[in-house]
């Protein structure tokens, strides 16, 4: 499988809020022994590899946004701690899963990674992630509602292992 | 701080049965995958048994039919049950917690609880 | 039997380097991961995903992997690092460790 980022850049005005997401690409085995475990976490551009570095978002480790299931299943973040940030991460039958961001401050701009972890007999044997920026603005310049940019194809689809 | 205690280790006769618990704390455990590893004295690691979040397990081939692992994520407890025990199950048993994200490595373990099987 | 094989010793005066090396099949395509015991304690994780370092271990440690063979090398020896050391990795469903390797300082 394979993860891919509809949207590189997301440009956001202050206090509006924000859903970035990622969507699950391939075959996805939905056998009974396999979890998909899915999560989000900020980083920042390494020379070598971008997501390595795995930093809190509001605060909130990629522990507490995480969300476990198996193969293309529902589910979301019902955590009191992260919808007290402002948080709330979701995933959908389709393979999309996201995380929203509410009343974005300039504190919030930078770079989100997902992570999507194939749980077999009980260990990973494979992990993707897909990257994406924020920006959030401020004053005059600020668009007055998010305006997202889509990835290049072969962005979308250049998955390099977490 | 992450802490896991293991207890209900001691002395048990041969044919016997016991039963282990490790209590967790400092983090939320029903996140995490957990396990069981044993070591005989003075010998190595081996590896018994692992849980994942929602209860599905996994066994050490030798040991399946015996032992057999549960959880109360209510409880914050891992517990090891343990029948038919025998002279070479004597050993050092830890509760050890699964690494996340990457699901591989064991990052925190027990201090251990003693089981001897002696007659 | 051990699917991963470690030297039973290894040993080192201070200020020295050791490599304890762990081998076995396909461990190229493992993630090895890297134990130390203290005389009479617990487990502590050293070295994860081949080369990674918890936080709060010492840089001394390093990981390294190539081929058929994982090493764990510990520069600067010191008095306190005389422990059992253990490699780990996944063989199919089930978590298998490697015989372990006595690191004695001299």
């Known amino acids: 499988f394979k993860v891919a980022t509809p949207y590189s850049l997301y440009v956001c005005p202050e206090g509006q809020n924000v859903t970035l997401t990622c969507r699950l690409l391939g075959p996805v085995d939905k056998g009974h022994d396999v979890t998909f475990y899915k999560t989000w976490y900020r980083s920042s551009r390494g020379e070598v590899q971008t997501c390595s570095e795995r930093r809190p978002i509001r605060n909130l480790t990629f522990q507490d946004l995480h969300l476990h299931h198996g193969g293309h299943q529902a589910a979301n973040t019902s955590h009191d701690l992260a919808q007290r940030h402002g948080l709330e991460s979701a995933s959908d039958h389709h393979g999309n899963f996201s995380i929203t961001m509410r009343n974005l401050t300039l504190l919030d701009s930078g770079l989100y990674c997902c992570l999507v972890v194939e749980i077999r007999h009980h260990h990973s044997e494979h992990r993707v992630h897909g990257a994406m920026e924020l920006q959030v603005q401020t004053g005059k310049d600020a668009p007055s509602n998010c305006v997202v940019y889509p990835s290049s194809s072969q962005d979308s689809e250049n998955i390099t292992a977490a | 701080e992450v802490q896991l205690l293991e207890s209900g280790g001691g002395l048990v006769q041969p044919g016997g049965s016991l039963r282990l618990s490790c209590a967790a704390s400092g983090f939320t455990f029903s996140n995490y995958y957990m396990h069981w590893v044993r070591q005989a004295p003075g010998k190595g690691l081996e590896w018994v048994s692992s849980?994942?979040?929602?209860?599905?397990?996994s066994y050490n081939p030798s040991l399946k039919s015996r032992f057999t692992i549960s959880r109360d994520n209510s409880k914050n407890t891992l517990y090891l049950q343990m029948n038919s025990l025998r002279a070479e199950d004597t050993a050092v048993y830890y509760c050890?917690?699964?690494?996340?994200?990457?699901?591989?490595?064991?990052?925190?373990w027990g201090q251990g609880t003693l089981v001897t099987v002696s007659s | 039997q051990s699917v991963l094989t470690q030297p039973p010793s290894a040993s080192g005066t201070p200020g020295q380097r050791v490599t304890i090396s762990c081998g076995g099949n396909n461990i190229g395509s493992k993630s090895v991961h890297w134990y130390q015991q203290l005389p009479g304690t617990a487990p502590k994780l050293l070295i994860y995903?081949?080369?990674e370092r918890p936080s709060g271990v010492s840089d001394r440690f390093s990981g390294s992997k190539s081929g058929t063979s994982a090493s764990l090398a510990i520069s600067g020896l010191r008095s306190e690092d005389e422990a059992d050391y253990y490699c780990?990795?996944?063989?199919?469903?089930?978590?298998?460790f490697g015989g372990g390797t006595k690191l004695t300082v001299l």
């Open positions: 780990q990795a996944w063989d199919s469903s089930t978590v298998v």
């Open positions: 995903e081949d080369t």
């Open positions: 050890a917690r699964l690494g996340i994200p990457f699901f591989t490595y064991l990052d925190y």
């Open positions: 849980i994942s979040f929602t209860g599905s397990t």
